[in-house]
Interface confidence: medium
């Protein structure tokens, strides 16, 4: 059972593997693609210039939680945010932006690269700590949306058994490993 979504201590949901934050629906369409007939006339900006895009990488530091367990240390990951359009053409206030070619392919600010990180989970009540390998967003990029982006193509890393901590004494009231595992599974 992998973590489909991590909840932080503020009950925000961090998308699990193969998922990414969906930006709000936009009317933004792109242009300057060979299949679309090239650049529209008199268009002064190059759509391939990354600096013209406002796909932002927001850093979030939070604890990852899994049932009653929580990561020993906070984890920092990126959340992709923003609209994929030339920055100078985006509105200052909230609103929709109409591009030149309303029927062009849709570009979104979504994760580009991921990184794997081992996270130690601390579980209360005498349960043994565990570790998980999780996949976190490492960078964002404006990408052309395909029908596959609506599906979860990636799978979560499976749970891994944590090595016992050195010098850790048995705690009063602690149950056996099987009881702990069953308890945690039942509590999810």
């Amino acid at each position: 059972q992998g973590w489909q979504a991590f909840r932080n201590d503020a009950t925000e949901v961090i998308p699990g593997l193969g998922e990414y934050p969906e930006p709000p629906p936009e009317n933004n369409q792109t242009m300057n693609r060979a299949e679309n007939g090239g650049r529209p006339p008199h268009h002064p900006y190059d759509a391939k210039d990354v600096s013209e895009y406002s796909c932002r990488e927001l850093h979030y530091t939070r604890f990852l939680t899994d049932g009653p367990c929580r990561s020993a240390k906070p984890v920092t990951e990126l959340v992709c945010s923003g609209q994929c359009g030339p920055a100078r053409l985006l509105p200052n206030a909230i609103g929709r932006v109409k591009w030149w070619r309303p029927n062009g392919p849709d570009f979104r600010c979504i994760p580009d690269r991921y990184r794997a990180q081992r996270v130690q989970l601390l579980c209360p009540g005498g349960a043994a700590p565990r570790s998980r390998k999780v996949r976190l967003v490492a960078s964002c990029k404006c990408k052309r949306l395909t029908r596959f982006h609506n599906q979860s193509e990636l799978k979560d890393f499976g749970p891994e058994t944590a090595r016992p901590q050195k010098g850790r004494k048995p705690r009063p009231g602690a149950r056996g490993a099987k009881a702990n595992q069953a308890e945690l599974e039942n509590a999810y």
């Epitope: 201590d9 503020a10 604890f63 939680t65 209360p124 009540g125 901590q165 009231g173």
Partner: nanobody
Amino acid sequence: EVQLVESGGGLVQPGGSLRLSCAASGSIFSDNVMGWYRQAPGKQRELVATIWSSGHTNYADSVKGRFTISRDNAKNTVYLQMNSLKPEDTAVYYCNLGTIVTGTWRSDYWGQGTQVTVSS
């Protein structure tokens, strides 16, 4: 030395309510988790609800929607509001405190337990 003192247990009719309290005294690290566990006769101790110092909560499926865990960090006290009690909730309820220092468990304490009996 840390001590946990539970209170609020008792006899209640099915459908009734009880509020358990657990006060921790002593030197307690700020990063900690407090929780309630219960043990019915002949059964293993099981998790009821936990709450981290940050406020993150977790409940056993059997009590979701009926029990609410809360805490007062200033008083190092955790509460368990139990509503719509059922006979199967009858058990000894134990308070637990675990503290964390530099990412590892520093201590784990248990209270003596308080009896909750749900019967008509």
